[in-house]
Amino acid sequence: PEPPTACREKQYLINSQCCSLCQPGQKLVSDCTEFTETECLPCGESEFLDTWNRETHCHQHKYCDPNLGLRVQQKGTSETDTICTCEEGWHCTSEACESCVLHRSCSPGFGVKQIATGVSDTICEPCPVGFFSNVSSAFEKCHPWTSCETKDLVVQQAGTNKTDVVCGPQDRLRA
């Protein structure tokens, strides 16, 4: 018979034949042959593989480093990685939670809508027209543009969401 060019799901093609992939939690020891099945071995302690695979090495479980404020939220198994979270009152810097911050800052152009608590991180909002923030802050709101008119001045440079307006003297008409 013709050697296969494609294999079924949970199989892989090697040496012109279809071999079974190893199930999650196991790694490949040897490919199948005409006479033998694929040989797989369970991952060791602190290792995992989360897909049907032909990997020869299992992945190490993530380490939740207490020096970065991390702790284990869910212990890893042979089929799943460890899930880290931050100590109480701290917040993950990303979905992967690789490090922790007390709270995040709002970038220039954004103001603080709600200051962080032990439960929720800082909530930022874009500065609307007429307001600006030129700093990165975890507590400052957007500031209103300076009103040149109330100082008997005129706008020399328009404000943006990151900069205040620049006021200047009114042009005096020459007689």
Partner: nanobody, 116 residues
């Protein structure tokens, strides 16, 4: 290496005052927003007060408004918290923190105990 070292804590009677200091080293202090945060025994972190990089803006938690004053001296690389009219509920370890507020930019704290 960024280091923040808090000092000035101690035992004080209700109604008394303390001034906490936070000495910074390993970075240029000026321009950084800074916070005082506290943790009471068996409780979570509470954000007490903050001061902007320029020193022009400040924030106080409702629980300390009118009693605590935050200030900074960039020439001495030091942050301060003047605490007046202290109450038993102010008992906590006080920490200072710097943007980006990561866990490794975190001092050892200074213990304030308010008790008669």
């Amino acid at each position: 290496e960024v280091q923040l070292l808090e000092s000035g804590g101690g035992l004080v009677q209700p109604g008394g005052s303390l001034r906490l200091s936070c000495a910074a080293s390993g970075f240029t202090f000026a321009g950084y927003e800074l916070w005082w945060v506290r943790q009471a025994p068996g409780k979570g972190l509470e954000r007490v007060s903050a001061i902007s990089g320029s020193g022009g803006s400040t924030y106080y938690a409702d629980s300390v408004k009118g009693r605590f004053t935050i200030s900074r001296d960039d020439s001495k690389n030091t942050l301060y918290l003047q605490m007046n009219s202290l109450r038993a509920e102010d008992t906590a370890v006080y920490y200072c923190a710097r943007d980006p507020y990561s866990f490794d930019y975190w001092g050892q704290g200074t213990l304030v105990t308010v008790s008669s």
